[in-house]
Interface confidence: medium
């Protein structure tokens, strides 16, 4: 049946639509397209006669239509008026007519919307805010986003006006967020810029920090006040009811007992007109001087310098104490204390010795702590690491490499490509790379303080073709029932699929086989001798594929319980005894024999010529595998009878 398919069905203004004809009959004279659902000469767009290959425009032809030999009609630069039905009239060679109708709809490309608000500074728990998405557009759907998430379900959120208006009732400070609206129609979707809702609130009850209320004479009193508030609160301090200053922090140096009393912080929000206060009581005690630490080297170099920390002041008949990282001193040959404990020496500092260090002076009542001292240990740079780890890239992508080396002060970085200096930055970015960007990428890290430099080189390959992969293994000789083996397919490449084969077959399903790392790594848990197969990895992307050479897993196993052959246990006197011992093992085991517990030879075969009844006894074969560290054995009893005394005996080997 003749049908018309519109591609696309929903068309944006200015774009084009193809009315595609399906099941066009054979032996045609020609065809004609009409605007509307019926054949109407006044609304003919274009006619086409096959014999002459002649297209003739009709009254409804706009100059934007192109008819194809397969009867399909392309309409370009679509306008709103083009919406509707289109009829194809087919005239067969036998002059029998056939018709089919198709349709499409035209929608405008939406403009970028914007948000209008009825209240730019709503007050918490009091005001409502209505956001409206502009402009109003016919046949458009309106959506709202809060912090780039769809609207949460809340009785305080209401949509109206065909979802064009979003109302927030009784705003709270938590409504301070980024709001966006979006308009959609079948051909486009546009999102507005963010509108940040600025909710006025507070002040809440202020908090005074620190919480400490007891101070020693000579200390500095530094109180800070904070109250949650928008806009930020204005602060005032009162001591024992007397106004002091309008600041957030109150600082009184070198306090005395006279500074004891009640300290009030008042927070005021000028926009909401609200005030809140908090009171703390401060007590100042008379105390001895606070200790402090001096250092003979403020910037020691790792593994080179020693540092001596001294606790000041020097006071007779005083006990000095030390703490590192808020712990008492660890036992270490690199930490030395002087006889009076006043000087702590760190021999050959490392980057882990930064501290903090505190010293203390013990008196009758308490221990006075110094301020913490942190050592600035200069170290590095260590060998830089270049990330990401990919070495293969496809042409056309962006190459972004980052270099990092542990260093104090932070390292200065340089990039070289094939030995040529490129730039002095930590990151190297090359857009839209081609195969010409393949090469040796060197990151050089330099520590200006120590003068030391370290480099790392990475090979980058840019190619549409994938390389031949190879398999690396974390264990070349795993032991059966004990070890796991991880095979990794090298190299790591972007946008690449990794595949594995065992003995030319795809991976069997087994709980002992696990793929990880984007299928790049194949792990065999608890290997068995049956895992000694040929493993191949493959890599493929949209343009090429390649397989590695096979890697055969060499599983060490055994020795299993040995078998002594022949199985005979009865022999005639005068026969030759020729016993062979075999045990399944990799590598081949070492063999030894014992007769009646007495060690014999270290061979796989035990041969005794012309045996007699004296050779009766237990014959034990011992096997040992040095690689697996395992041993095994079997014992066989041999009976030798005098010639002709017993029928059916073995004649020997």
């Amino acid at each position: 049946k003749l049908t018309i398919e519109s591609t696309p069905f929903n068309v944006a203004e200015g774009k084009e639509v193809l009315l595609l004809v399906h099941n066009l009959p054979q032996h045609l004279f020609g065809y004609s397209w009409y605007k509307g659902e019926r054949v109407d000469g006044n609304r003919q767009i274009i006619g086409y006669v096959i014999g002459t290959q002649q297209a003739t425009p009709g009254p409804a032809y706009s100059g934007r239509e192109i008819i194809y030999p397969n009867a399909s009609l392309l309409i370009q630069n679509i306008i709103q008026n083009d919406t509707g039905f289109y009829t194809l009239h087919v005239i067969k060679s036998d002059l029998v007519n056939e018709e089919a109708t198709g349709q499409f709809r035209v929608y405008p490309e939406l403009p970028k919307p914007s948000i209008s608000s009825n209240n730019s500074k709503p007050v918490e728990d009091k005001d409502a805010v209505a956001f409206t998405c502009e402009p109003e557009t016919q046949d458009a759907t309106y959506l709202w986003w809060v912090n780039n998430q769809s609207l949460p379900v809340s009785p305080r959120l209401q949509l109206s006006n065909g979802n064009r208006t979003l109302t927030l009732f009784n705003v709270t400070r938590n409504d301070t967020a980024s709001y966006k609206c979006e308009t959609q129609n079948p051909v486009s979707a546009r999102r507005s810029d963010s509108v940040i809702l600025n909710v006025l609130y507070g002040p809440d009850a202020p908090t005074i920090s620190p919480l400490n209320t007891s101070y020693r004479s000579g200390e500095n009193l530094n109180l800070s006040c904070h109250a949650a508030s928008n806009p930020p609160a204005q602060y005032s301090w009162f001591v024992n009811g007397t106004f002091q200053q309008s600041t957030q922090e109150l600082f009184i140096p070198n306090i005395t007992v006279n500074n004891s009393g009640s300290y009030t912080c008042q927070a005021h929000n000028s926009d909401t007109g609200l005030n809140r206060t908090t009171v703390t009581t401060i007590t100042v005690y008379a105390e001895p001087p606070k200790p402090f630490i001096t250092s003979n080297n403020s910037n020691p170099v790792e593994d080179e310098d020693a540092v001596a920390l001294t606790c000041e002041p020097e006071i007779q008949n005083t006990t000095y104490l030390w703490w590192v990282n808020n712990q008492s001193l660890p036992v270490s040959p690199r930490l030395q204390l002087s006889n009076d404990n006043r000087t702590l020496t760190l021999l050959s500092v490392t980057r882990n010795d930064v501290g903090p260090y505190e010293c203390g002076i013990q008196n009758e009542l308490s221990v006075d702590h110094s301020d913490p001292v942190i050592l600035n240990v200069l170290y590095g740079p260590d060998d830089p690491t270049i990330s990401p780890s990919y070495t293969y890239y496809r042409p056309g992508v962006n190459l972004s490499l980052s270099c990092h080396a542990a260093s104090n002060p932070p390292a200065q970085y340089s990039w070289l490509i094939d030995g040529n200096i490129q730039q002095h930055t930590q990151e190297l970015f090359i857009s839209n790379i081609t195969e010409k960007n393949s090469g040796l990428y060197t990151c050089q890290a330099n520590n200006s303080a120590s003068g030391h430099s370290r480099t790392t080189v990475k090979t980058i390959t840019v190619s549409a073709e994938l390389p031949k992969p190879s398999i690396s293994s974390n264990n070349s000789k795993p032991v059966e029932d004990k070890d796991a083996v991880a095979f990794t397919c090298e190299p790591e490449a972007q946008n690449t699929t990794y595949l594995w084969w065992v003995n030319g077959q795809s991976l069997p399903v087994s709980p002992r086989l696990q793929l990880s790392n984007g299928n790049r790594t194949l792990t065999l848990f608890n290997v068995t001798r049956n895992d000694a197969r040929a493993y191949v990895c493959g890599i493929q992307n949209s343009v090429s594929a390649n397989r590695s050479d096979p890697v055969t897993l060499d599983v060490l196993y055994g020795p299993d319980t040995p078998i002594i052959s022949p199985p005979d246990s009865s022999y005639l006197s005068g026969a030759n005894l020729n016993l062979s011992c075999h045990s399944a093992s990799n590598p081949s085991p070492q063999y030894s024999w014992r007769i009646n517990g007495i060690p014999q030879q270290h061979t796989q075969v035990l041969f005794i010529a012309k045996i007699t009844p004296n050779n009766n006894g237990t014959y034990a074969c011992f096997v040992s595998n040095l690689a697996t560290g395992r041993n095994n054995s079997i014992v066989k009893s041999i009976t030798v009878s005098a010639s002709g005394t017993s029928p059916g005996l073995s004649a020997g080997a």
Epitope: T434, E435, K436, S438, T461, S463, K468
Partner: antibody, heavy 124, light 110 residues
Framework: EVQLVQSGAEVVKPGASVKMSCKAS????????MHWVKQAPGQGLEWIGW????????EYAPKFQGKATMTTDTSTSTAYLELSSLRSEDTAVYYC?????????????????WGAGTLVTVSS | DIVLTQSPASLAVSLGERATINCRAS??????????MHWYQQKPGQPPKLLIY???NLQSGVPARFSGSGSGTDFTLTISSVQAEDVATYYC????????FGGGTKLEIK
């Protein structure tokens, strides 16, 4: 087929200049660096330098700085090598070469496509 | 510049015999898992032809009797069974920095 076709032999006088050409076919010249290599009679190979046809970037071996100038014309897929202030020791076969399209590579500087060479003879 | 020294300068081998050519670099040409050493064959009146790239990879179309090995500073080109058509001069070339070639080894048939 990937090919580099070089211009014919030249005989030039000492002190003069010579400009030889290397026409690429079977691939887009912009996608690959073009290199030049010198081989004096009975001697080994010496790398002269490379040019990136896409942007004209060049790099020369120190010995050929000031002696050789590499250029390209991407519209004709042709690379040029000009040698100036010629002396008898500049007598040699000059090859253009590049990395071909078939080989997997990890760095840009090995050469599996070579021109047949242009013999330059400097003689008074 | 990295200097490449080839040895021997010339080599005479019987048909079917093994030939070994060495190339030593004045500093390492290996980095990040690759060795940037390549080998070429040049016959009289012809341009060089790539045999081995990245120390051990056989270039497409080159007979399997040619192989390359080595890392760091010492590299070897081996022809397992020399044929009459292998008479040529062989060059090593590195690409760890700006390229340089070795002085060449001339292979002849005894």
């Amino acid at each position: 087929e990937v090919q580099l076709v070089q211009s014919g032999a030249e005989v030039v006088k000492p002190g003069a200049s010579v400009k030889m050409s290397c026409k690429a076919s079977g691939f887009n010249i912009k996608d690959y660096y073009m290199h030049w290599v010198k081989q004096a009679p009975g001697q080994g190979l010496e790398w002269i330098g490379w040019i990136d046809p896409e942007n004209g970037d060049t790099e020369y071996a120190p010995k050929f700085q000031g002696k050789a100038t590499m250029t390209t014309d991407t519209s004709t897929s042709t690379a040029y090598l000009e040698l100036s202030s010629l002396r008898s020791e500049d007598t040699a076969v000059y090859y253009c070469n590049t990395r071909g399209l078939s080989t997997m590579i990890t760095t840009r500087w090995f050469f599996d496509v070579w021109g047949a060479g242009t013999l330059v003879t400097v003689s008074s | 510049d990295i200097v490449l020294t080839q040895s021997p300068a010339s080599l005479a081998v019987s048909l079917g015999e093994r030939a070994t050519i060495n190339c030593r670099a004045s500093k390492s040409v290996s980095a990040s898992g690759y060795s940037y050493m390549h080998w070429y064959q040049q016959k009289p009146g012809q341009p060089p032809k790539l045999l081995i790239y990245l120390a051990s990879n056989l270039q497409s179309g080159v007979p399997a009797r040619f192989s390359g090995s080595g890392s760091g500073t010492d590299f070897t080109l081996t022809i397992s069974s020399v044929q009459a058509e292998d008479v040529a001069t062989y060059y090593c070339q590195h690409s760890r920095e700006l390229p340089t070639f070795g002085g060449g080894t001339k292979l002849e048939i005894k």
